[in-house]
């Protein structure tokens, strides 16, 4: 019979970017296992990542279901063998996570630059509307579909001869800049929900300059 | 076909051991949980624990902690389930069952043909 | 441990009947519950998996359903292959726990 006893789970963590969430916590469990558990406020516990050794566990099926909810999730220690267990009168040890709410909460990925078309003085940028893994009638929604006129972007361009920067911003995924003729602009997009209080904005795109492959140019 | 087969019945004597058996086939061994249910004359189901064939961790119920240990080899895909200090009372037919993963639902969807266990002096 | 109180623990019907067999458990356990039929000398074999879905190759007159902790299991013909003791089996908790079982009969 082992001596180690069970310890209950510490430092539980939401990592959440596009809808895509995981649980993390401490430690590395020696001879223990893990079970965790995801509930609404007024909903069911309901059991995932079962008798596991990890120390992580993606809860994206269940948070996806109602992203506006309010999750809260717990991680059961259970003694691996023949371990003795610390719970008192055979409770169950177990910890709680901070409550989570994936619509106010979950990083926006970072955007990608779909294309850039050049009409004259005007260029058009197009960012790629993402994909979550969000569903509904048996679809995967996109960013813009879960998100609304809640979702802009920031575009930040310059022309490639200097370093002095320009911002627009949309509601769309479209922005329609003015460029000086003969010139070429490099761009970079985030993602931004304004009426966020955390997680406001992704990290920047990728740049993307024109006189690469991704743009479309016409006189 | 995914199959379990158990070892054949045993008689033993109240305090001795007995290590039953389950050798898995038709799947990968490693990618799913194995479970062991003994159920006593007449009487219904009870779990005994849980092994992770790919590392070997187990998990007991408490009323086994300490009588009970669940190995595997997997390079015959066989799991063990060793129960000591045998009573009167362990008389049953034990089962192995394959159940479940990390992600998966704990439904037992492949059960062994079971293997009685008789402790008489 | 979870308590799953099955009733009635037997009961006997005509080939043809309905037969409805409840189990309860002791606190929410979701949908985590599974319903097994064991026929006399033989390993048992699940037939519902998360309170309501039909494993593959189960014939669809058994079906499963949840109300809260009170769930509901259902042959709505009943076959005379059908005489055995169906058990529930919970998996929120652990550790694992069965129902004691419904012995069903023909009339």
């Known amino acids: 019979s082992g001596t180690t006893n069970t310890v209950a789970a510490y430092n539980l963590t939401w990592k959440s970017t596009n809808f895509k969430t995981i649980l993390e916590w401490e430690p590395k469990p020696v001879n223990q296992v893990y079970t965790v558990q995801i509930s609404t406020k007024s909903g069911d516990w309901k059991s995932k990542c079962f008798y596991t050794t990890d120390t992580e566990c993606d809860l994206t099926d269940e948070i996806v279901k109602d992203v506006k909810q309010t999750y809260l999730a717990r991680v059961f220690s259970y003694p691996a063998g023949n371990v003795e267990s610390t719970g008192s009168a055979g409770e169950p040890l177990y910890e709680n996570s901070p409550e989570f709410t994936p619509y106010l909460e979950t990083n926006l990925g970072q955007p990608t630059i779909q294309s850039f078309e050049q009409v004259g003085t005007k260029v058009n940028v197009t960012v790629e509307d993402e994909r979550t893994l969000v569903r509904r009638n048996n679809t995967f929604l996109s960013l813009r579909d879960v998100f609304g006129n809640d979702l802009g972007y920031i575009l930040t361009y310059r022309k490639s001869s200097s370093s002095g920067k320009k911002t627009a911003k949309t509601n769309t995924n479209e922005f329609l800049i003015d460029v000086d003729k003969g010139e070429n602009y490099c761009f970079s997009v985030q993602a931004v929900i304004p009426s966020r209080t955390v997680n406001r904005k992704s990290t920047d795109s990728p740049v993307e300059c024109m006189g690469q492959e991704k743009g479309e140019f016409r006189e | 076909q995914v199959q379990l087969v158990q070892s054949g019945a045993e008689v033993k004597k109240p305090g001795a051991s007995v290590k039953v058996s389950c050798k898995a086939s038709g799947y990968t061994f490693a990618n799913y949980y194995m479970h062991w249910v003994r159920q006593a004359p007449g009487q219904g189901l009870e779990w005994m624990g849980i092994?992770?064939?790919?590392?070997?961790?187990?998990v007991y119920a408490q009323k086994f902690q300490g009588r009970v240990t669940m190995t595997r080899d997997t390079s015959t895909s066989t799991v063990y389930m060793e129960l000591s200090s045998l009573r009167s009372e362990d008389t049953a037919v034990y089962y192995c069952a394959r159940g479940g993963s990390k992600v998966a639902a704990l439904a037992f969807d492949i059960w062994g043909q079971g293997t009685m266990v008789t402790v008489s002096s | 441990d979870i308590q799953m109180t099955q009733s009635p623990s037997s009961l006997s019907a005509s080939v043809g009947d309905r037969v409805t067999i409840t189990c309860q458990a002791s606190q929410d356990i979701s949908n985590s519950l599974n319903w097994y039929q064991q026929k006399p000398g033989k390993a048992p074999k699940l037939l519902i998996y998360d309170a309501s879905n039909l494993e593959t190759g189960v014939p669809s007159r058994f079906s499963g359903s949840r109300s809260g902790t009170d769930f509901t299991f259902t042959i709505s013909s009943l076959q005379p292959e059908d005489i055995a003791t169906y058990y529930c089996?919970?998996?929120?908790?652990?550790?694992?726990?069965f129902g004691g079982g419904t012995k069903v009969e023909i009339k």
């Open positions: 089996q919970q998996y929120n908790f652990h550790p694992l726990t």
């Open positions: 092994i992770n064939p790919s590392g070997g961790i187990t």
